[in-house]
Every structure is written in C-alpha cells, then in structure tokens.
C-alpha cells in the first residue's frame, strides 16, 4: 500500500514538474532587465525568453515579438530550445511508460513487468529532470557571468527571470518524482526474483540449503 502511495506521489510530482517545465520553456522571462539596488537600470524593461522577447515601455505598454528565424539565433539559445523541448518529450514518454506499468492499469498483467516499467519511467523522469536543468543552469551562468563582466554594457546586463526559477522547480520535481518511482520498485521487483529462486530450489532437491537460507516469506 505504501508502495502505491509512493508511486502516486511520484507521478503527481513529475506531472507538476512537467507543467512547470512547459510554463518555464514558454514564458519569455528567462532573462530580465537588471535592477541595481531599487532603481531600474532603464525605463525600457526587456524580457527575453527562448521563443520571444518583450519590451515594457515606461508608459506600461508591452510589446512582444517571436524570434524571426531559427538560424539567426545564437547557438546557446538554439541549444536551450532543443533541450527544453526534448526534456518535455522525454517526460511525456516517461508518463506513458509509467501508465503502462502502473498498479491500477491492466496494460501489463505481470507484476515483474509492471515493476520494471515503473522503474524505467522513474529513470526516464530523472533524465528529463537533468535535461531541464542543463539549459536553466547554463542560462543562469551566462547571466551571472555577464552581470559581473565590466565589458558588458549596463543596458545589456540581465537578471535571472521567473522562467529560470520555474525551470529549477520543474527539474527538482522531475528528479524527486522520478526518484520516488525508482524507489517503489525494489519492493515490487524483489518479489519476482526471490519467488523464482524459491520455486527453483524446491523443484531441485539436489541443491541442499540450510533452512535459514530460504526466504520464509515465499512459503505458503
């Protein structure tokens, strides 16, 4: 029962992580105009995302525009885009794998196979979490590096945007959820091998073992 509870918690966390990741990737708030103390660096506030950039004028009017062409974009931005999309797709794949192996589904009947699928989904979610973490950390590193670089003009200095925090949360949730799903498996997975061991040993009397060596829980 505890195993099922952990599975549900794990998948809920990964779903939350996936939604967070989706919002993080979509929002144009990866890099935002820097503030120095309480004073804004310039009246023209800039937000930059993976897909578009926005400018909030001093009047409060906001303009956004999707990036014109893929090839004209900086390579790090292209890489971040790709990793974001791949991470989301990998997490979706993990969800499908989980659904196939979940305790409440009948896609796969065998308990061992179910356990293996849940373990696989957990690993896939962990991979998705790592893939989400890479562009977020890379972007954060670039922002911090430029912020303290005297050769970067003040107008071009940026701060960490809300999307990065969402990205970190998404990564954390995917890693945690995936980890929980991986942890639910030993209990389900260990039944299989030990069960076969017991059945094999009883059907082969030539192999003699001391009574203490048999896992007693497998005796009916």
């Amino acid at each position: 029962m505890a195993s099922a509870g952990m599975q549900i918690l794990g998948v809920v966390l990964t779903l939350l992580g996936w939604v967070n990741g989706l919002v993080s990737c979509a929002l144009p708030m990866w890099k935002v105009t820097a503030f120095i103390g309480n004073s804004i660096v310039v009246a023209q506030v800039v937000w930059e995302g993976l897909w578009m950039s926005c400018v909030v004028q001093s009047t409060g009017q906001m303009q956004c525009k999707v990036y014109d062409s893929l090839l004209a974009l900086p390579q790090d931005l292209q890489a971040a885009r790709a990793l974001c999309v791949i991470a989301l797709l990998v997490a979706l794949f993990g969800l499908l794998v989980y659904l196939a192996g979940a305790k409440c589904t009948t896609c796969v009947e065998e308990k061992d196979s179910k356990a293996r699928l849940v373990l696989t989904s957990g690993i896939v979610f962990v991979i998705s979490g790592v893939l989400t973490l890479i562009p977020v950390c890379w972007t954060a590193h670039a922002i911090i590096r430029d912020f303290y670089n005297p050769l970067v003009a003040e107008a071009q200095k940026r701060e960490l945007g809300a999307s990065l925090y969402l990205g970190w949360a998404a990564s954390g949730l995917l890693l945690l959820g995936g980890g929980l799903l991986c942890c639910t498996c030993p209990s389900g997975g260990s039944q299989g091998p030990s069960h076969y061991m017991a059945r094999y040993s009883t059907s082969a009397p030539a192999i003699s073992r001391g009574p203490s060596e048999y896992p007693t829980k497998n005796y009916v």
Epitope: V41, K65, A72, L73, E154
Partner: antibody
Framework: EVQLVQSGAEVKKPGASVKVSCKAS????????MNWVRQAPGQGLEWMGE????????TYNQKFKARVTITRDTSTSTAYMELSSLRSEDTAVYYC????????????????WGQGTLVTVSS | DIQMTQSPSSLSASVGDRVTITCQAS??????LNWYQQKPGKAPKLLIY???KLEDGVPSRFSGSGSGTDFTFTISSLQPEDFATYYC????????FGQGTKVEIK
C-alpha cells in the same frame, strides 16, 4: 518623429575643454541610453561612451575614461559630452546616438543619430 | 577589448555588381553585430541589426549573415546611391566599430 539635435561647431585651443549638447525629442528621453561616437577627419568611427538618462549612470571607452564626462538633464531631454585636456588629435565630428532594443533578435543598435558637431582643436 | 577586423578597406565596383564585405571579431559576439552606411558629411545610417535583420525601410538588396566571430555583409546588386563607406559594429562587449570599407565607383 525621433530627432537628436546637436550644438554647433566649436574651435578650441589645446588643453581646453569642450561641451557638446544633444537635445532629444519625439520619444521618452529616459527610456533609451544615449551614446557618443566620434570620427576624426578621413578616419573611422570610434565609440566614446554612453549614459543611462533614467539614472545618470555612465559607461566609458577606456581610451577616453580619464578625459570624458557624459551627463544629462532630464528636464530638457538633453545629453552632454564634455572632453577635457584637448589635443590636436581630438579634432573630429562628435555624434550622439540613441541605443534601441530590437525585438525578435535580442539585439541592440544605435538607431537614431544626431547631425554631428565638428570640434576643431587648434593653437 | 574586442577588435573588429573589416575587409577589404576599400573596393571598386560597378553598378549592378555584387559586393561582399567581411567583418571578423577577435572573440565571439554572438549575433550582436550591426552594419552601417555612411556618406560624406552625414551621420551613419543603420542597415542591418542582429547580424542578419534588415532595418525598416532599407532595400532588400542589402543583407547580412554570420554569428560568433565571422560576419558577411552583401549588396546583391550595387546601385548608384550605394557608393559610400560601410562599417560593422559589435555590441556584445560595449561597442566596437570595424575600420570601415569604402565602396567606390570603378
């Protein structure tokens, strides 16, 4: 219509200082950084520095840092560039230019320029 | 500091010719590069921003490409009004202009 109107030509003696003004109109002055660029006769363009009109903070080219001062007056939407300890090699046309952000490219450019102010340094 | 090496420093061409100017940065400037046209006695005019984006109102015969350290500016079919000096300008690290390329009539 965005316009940057600069002060008239100046003739200065070596060692003196010159202050060139740049009056902005047609946009929110405090919303865009103002840059200063110079061009010696028959030479290329050389960036000198920029000011954030919203805060007054400045960034200078190392080459001019000791001699240049960029200021602004938000009440008149005017930026100023003062160059001290003038030498004959400072004879040039001085331009002010607005920095703008280009949506869809994560890029900046100096999009509007003043007409230029010729400063002649001669003994 | 970033150095911008523009070449050639001057070139002679005829109306209708295809003209190519290159600009090389001493380190990567991403896509933070602009191209300007300057005519004698006039202020520079922005043609290309973000390495390849055409400024509004600029004829489509002008184009730019490149990213990182190597950039190219092209005039597909030179017109009489295109005889001028062209400058590249990086703004990844403060601002640095190339030395300029003077396009003259052959």
């Amino acid at each position: 219509e965005v316009q940057l109107v600069q002060s008239g030509a100046e003739v200065k003696k070596p060692g003196a200082s010159v202050k060139v003004s740049c009056k902005a109109s047609g946009y929110t002055f405090t919303g865009y950084y103002m840059n200063w660029v110079r061009q010696a006769p028959g030479q290329g363009l050389e960036w000198m520095g920029e000011i954030n009109p919203a805060t007054g903070s400045t960034t200078y080219n190392q080459k001019f840092k000791a001699r240049v001062t960029i200021t602004r007056d938000t009440s008149t939407s005017t930026a100023y560039m003062e160059l001290s300890s003038l030498r004959s090699e400072d004879t040039a046309v001085y331009y002010c230019a607005r920095r703008d952000y280009y949506l869809g490219s994560n890029s900046y450019a100096l999009d509007y320029w003043g007409q230029g102010t010729l400063v002649t340094v001669s003994s | 500091d970033i150095q911008m090496t523009q070449s050639p420093s001057s070139l002679s061409a005829s109306v209708g010719d295809r003209v190519t100017i290159t600009c090389q940065a001493s380190q990567s400037v991403s896509n933070n590069l602009n191209w300007y046209q300057q005519k004698p006695g006039k202020a520079p005019k922005l043609l290309i921003y973000g390495a390849s984006k055409l400024e509004d109102g600029v004829p489509s015969r002008f184009s730019g490409s490149g990213s990182g350290t190597d950039f190219t500016f092209t005039i597909s079919s030179l017109q009489p009004e295109d005889f001028a000096t062209y400058y590249c300008l990086q703004h990844r690290y403060l601002w640095t202009f190339g030395q300029g390329t003077k396009v003259e009539i052959k």
